[in-house]
């Protein structure tokens, strides 16, 4: 004979445990009903009638299949350095994210608690490391024969122009000015226009909170800005 | 320029622990992170972690982390890579590399060897 | 991980030839690929950064491109000391890795 299928509330037999999506309550002894996911428990489950469910109400949330008597509260609106990644709904929590130009410097258990802009590099810095979400850039200087002209929390150093005839040296912060004769670049033309954002601090930037979107690159201008980091190794 | 001088080759036993150096010299070594590159004989090049000395932050490979350790020492620009619980597939070359805001590893140690031999 | 493979594994090309060397990401790494030279018992040194960009001092017969997934390292014409390893490395995400290497050998 099939066993017979047992409709909550039942007690369990000895030694057993309750099946999916139900729960036991000490108090009835009994194998009772979770609610589901944007629902909480009004009415806990007696020896002879079911758990009775209720929907959550405004601004709360329930996840997972429960029993609890009142719904979770959602998160407090995102601040104005934040984006709503996930509004808050009676099955979900909100989730606030750092916008673009800011990276996660205090996480909570679902997106982020406080967010930080990232930090530019200064002239003469490049960034060797990118910003990610939750990690600010690290900035560092110029290896010799390369240059970084701008503030950016994007952009890399790249080489100095080679001049026939030099007019002024480049150094870190200032490409080489060639004379009247065209000058050869050290890389391939339209190259490296690069989107952002792992990892540190350094002593030579100021972090401020206006994302950087660098400029198209020009390699035939001696002054042009640096070509930006892309998003590069995340944690 | 900068240069990055490591320190000599070592001969370990299985389970032994291996501490290289890496002393970076014409620059400081807060201009630079510093990178550490595994090389198994005949082998290609596998990345370990990298350190900022500025700061010692550190970032591993997920494959050596339980057993590598990056440290930087500022006053003497020196950077260690210290690898634990040595196993044969350890011999390898190791290089220390450092990069600046160019976001590449523009200059490379000479290389250290390490044999692990019962 | 992302899985980084050049081809061929072994070039032979005569000197003053072009040799063409293709390093594909398993995912795409945008334009976070270096380019590396390496001789026997010597380092690696840097040839080309952020996919395009050729390093201080690289002479200008080397030159790289691509993005996303597919990039590509040219020696437009070979001189005697290009023979070498060379090696590709995306640094778009952690781990950072390589892949395994062309050689180039003389024709």
């Known amino acids: 004979l099939p066993a017979q299928v047992a409709f909550t509330p039942y007690a369990p037999e000895p030694g057993s445990t309750c099946r999916l999506r139900e729960y036991y309550d000490q108090t009835a002894q009994m194998c009772c009903s979770k609610c589901s996911p944007g629902q909480h428990a009004k009415v806990f489950c007696t020896k002879t009638s079911d758990t009775v469910c209720d929907s959550c109400e405004d601004s709360t949330y329930t996840q997972l299949w429960n029993w609890v008597p009142e719904c979770l509260s959602c998160g407090s609106r995102c601040s104005s350095d934040q984006v709503e990644t996930q509004a808050c709904t009676r099955e979900q929590n909100r989730i606030c994210t750092c916008r673009p130009g800011w990276y996660c410097a205090l996480s909570k258990q679902e997106g982020c608690r406080l967010c930080a802009p990232l930090r530019k590099c200064r002239p003469g810095f490049g960034v060797a490391r990118p910003g990610t979400e939750t990690s600010d850039v690290v900035c560092k200087p110029c290896a010799p024969g390369t240059f970084s002209n701008t503030t950016s929390s994007t952009d890399i150093c790249r080489p100095h122009q080679i001049c026939n005839v030099v007019a002024i040296p480049g150094n870190a912060s200032m490409d080489a000015v060639c004379t009247s004769t065209s000058p050869t670049r050290s890389m391939a033309p339209g190259a490296v226009h690069l989107p952002q954002p792992v990892s540190t601090r350094s002593q030579h930037t100021q972090p401020t909170p206006e994302p950087s979107t660098a400029p198209s690159t020009s390699f035939l201008l001696p002054m042009g800005p640096s070509p930006p980091a892309e998003g590069s190794t995340g944690d | 320029e900068v240069q990055l001088v490591q320190s000599g080759a070592e001969v370990k036993k299985p389970g032994a622990t291996v501490k290289i150096s890496c002393k970076v010299s014409?620059?400081?070594?807060?201009?630079?992170?510093l990178h550490w590159v595994q090389q198994a004989p005949g082998k290609g090049l596998e990345w370990m972690g990298w350190i900022d000395p500025e700061d010692a932050k550190t970032k591993y490979g997920q494959k050596f982390q339980s057993r590598v350790t990056i440290t930087a020492d500022t006053s003497t620009d020196t950077a260690y890579m210290e690898l634990s619980s040595l196993r044969s597939e350890d011999t390898a070359v190791y290089y220390c590399?450092?990069?600046?805001?160019?976001?590449?590893?523009?200059?490379w140690g000479q290389g250290t060897l390490v044999t692990v031999s019962s | 991980d992302i899985v980084m493979t050049q081809s061929p594994a072994t070039l032979s090309v005569s000197p003053g030839e072009r040799a063409t060397l293709s390093c594909k990401a398993s995912?795409?790494?945008?334009?976070?690929v270096d380019w590396y030279q390496q001789k026997p018992g010597q380092s690696p040194r840097v040839l080309i950064y952020?996919?395009?960009i050729r390093y201080t001092g690289i002479p200008a017969r080397f030159s790289g491109s691509g993005s996303g997934t597919e990039f590509t390292l040219t020696i437009s014409i070979l001189q005697s000391e290009d023979f070498a390893v060379y090696f590709c490395?995306?640094?778009?995400?952690?781990?950072?890795?390589f892949g395994q290497g062309t050689k180039l050998e003389i024709k």
């Open positions: 590399a450092a990069q600046s805001g160019t976001g590449t590893m523009d200059a």
């Open positions: 952020k996919a395009s």
């Open positions: 995912q795409n790494v945008g334009s976070n």
């Open positions: 014409g620059y400081s070594i807060t201009d630079y992170l």
């Open positions: 490395m995306q640094s778009k995400s952690y781990p950072i890795t």
